[in-house]
Interface confidence: medium
């Protein structure tokens, strides 16, 4: 099956950057987001710190680390309240990402 | 061979302090969230509170809330229970828990200490 | 919160299911724990619905069916005799999640 433009296979993101003028010259803002196209069962997430179609069963019962969500060689802590999660460098700089 | 050895239960008086420690081998212990759960006796398990991995973030239970804190090292791998102002009903057997994922909740359980008892009483 | 029943009993090869319903985090599935005297630790049998330490027997199971968990014992034998809780999370806007317990079912083995 062929995938028309702009068309994302099953299962897969990618990050689209928006770029837009600001009113002030010279000045321009760029704004990340992600395009999913997940698969039944599966939700927009983060695996290895990138946007990913992750099981939803992990969204709904809010084990964030069971995403995998940060980089290879770091550890996942689920903050208690599961609000997020944290990531811990091997040097110990923690990175906290809390879900809204 | 998991083990979860506590200590620094006995007597102690209302109004006073206890610190509980928690000896932990036989699994890479900053891996895993740990827990403190209690035991009136003659009662259920009452649970106390958690920490995570790190040690950067803890939860209680409400009848414990305000007067404990949990803490761990996880170079020595132990983790510590301080209760202050204490009453009669934080007498029972206080036991260690480890959670058995990247979590600990009271499903995710899968190893305990033998415990130590607190008798508070003047 | 958790509603579990005070005592069940059953003759050694027999078939046992101890319930537990209730709870604010079904997602976060239930745990079961074992306690064969007040003074003594309690053993886990089940955790996260149905995973069972290595050092468990397979006759200890866990399902669920709709918000009620159950521990089965199949072919219950005499060491089996024990109080077991079920163990699940609550939410509380003041506390967080927090751990809640059944009181506990008394397993009598004729």
């Known amino acids: 099956q062929f995938l028309k433009e702009g068309q994302l296979a099953a299962g897969t993101c990618e990050i689209v950057t928006l770029d837009r003028d600001s009113s002030q010259p010279r000045i321009e803002e760029r704004s990340q987001t992600a395009r999913c196209a997940c698969r039944k069962g599966q939700i927009a997430g983060t695996t290895r710190a990138r946007p990913a179609c992750v099981d939803a069963r992990i969204i709904k019962t809010k084990q964030w680390c069971d995403m995998l969500p940060c980089l290879e060689g770091e550890g996942c802590d689920l903050l208690i309240n599961r609000s997020g999660w944290t990531c811990t460098q091997p040097g110990g700089r923690i990175k906290t990402t809390t879900v809204s | 061979a998991v083990t979860l050895d506590e200590s620094g239960g006995g007597l102690q008086t209302p109004g006073g302090a206890l610190s509980l420690v928690c000896k932990a081998s036989?699994?890479?212990?900053?891996?895993?969230?740990m827990g403190w759960v209690r035991q009136a006796p003659g009662k259920g398990l009452e649970w106390v509170g958690v920490?995570?991995?790190?040690?950067?973030?803890?939860s209680y239970g409400s009848a414990v809330k305000g007067r404990a804190t949990i803490s761990r090292d996880n170079g020595q791998s132990t983790v510590r229970l301080q209760l202050n102002n204490l009453r009669a009903e934080d007498t029972g057997t206080y036991f260690c828990?480890?959670?058995?994922?990247?979590?600990?909740?009271?499903?995710?359980?899968?190893?305990w200490g033998h415990g130590t008892e607190v008798i508070v009483s003047s | 919160a958790l509603t579990q029943p005070s005592s069940v009993s059953a003759n050694p090869g027999e078939t046992v299911k101890i319930t537990c319903s209730g709870g604010g985090s079904s997602g976060y599935g239930y745990g079961w724990y074992q306690q064969k005297s007040p003074s003594s630790a309690p053993l886990t049998v089940i955790?996260?619905?149905?995973k069972r330490p290595s050092d468990i027997p397979s006759r200890f199971s866990g399902s669920k069916s709709g918000s009620t968990h159950t521990l089965t014992i199949t072919g219950v034998q005499a060491e089996d005799e024990a109080v077991y809780f079920c163990?699940?999370?609550?939410?509380?806007?003041?506390?967080?999640?927090?751990?809640?317990f059944g009181a506990g079912t008394t397993l009598t083995v004729l």
């Open positions: 920490i995570n991995k790190s040690g950067s973030d803890t």
């Open positions: 163990g699940n999370d609550d939410y509380s806007s003041d506390s967080g999640y927090v751990g809640v």
């Open positions: 828990a480890k959670g058995s994922a990247s979590y600990i909740t009271a499903a995710t359980i899968d190893a």
């Open positions: 036989g699994f890479t212990f900053s891996s895993y969230q």
């Open positions: 955790y996260w619905n149905d």
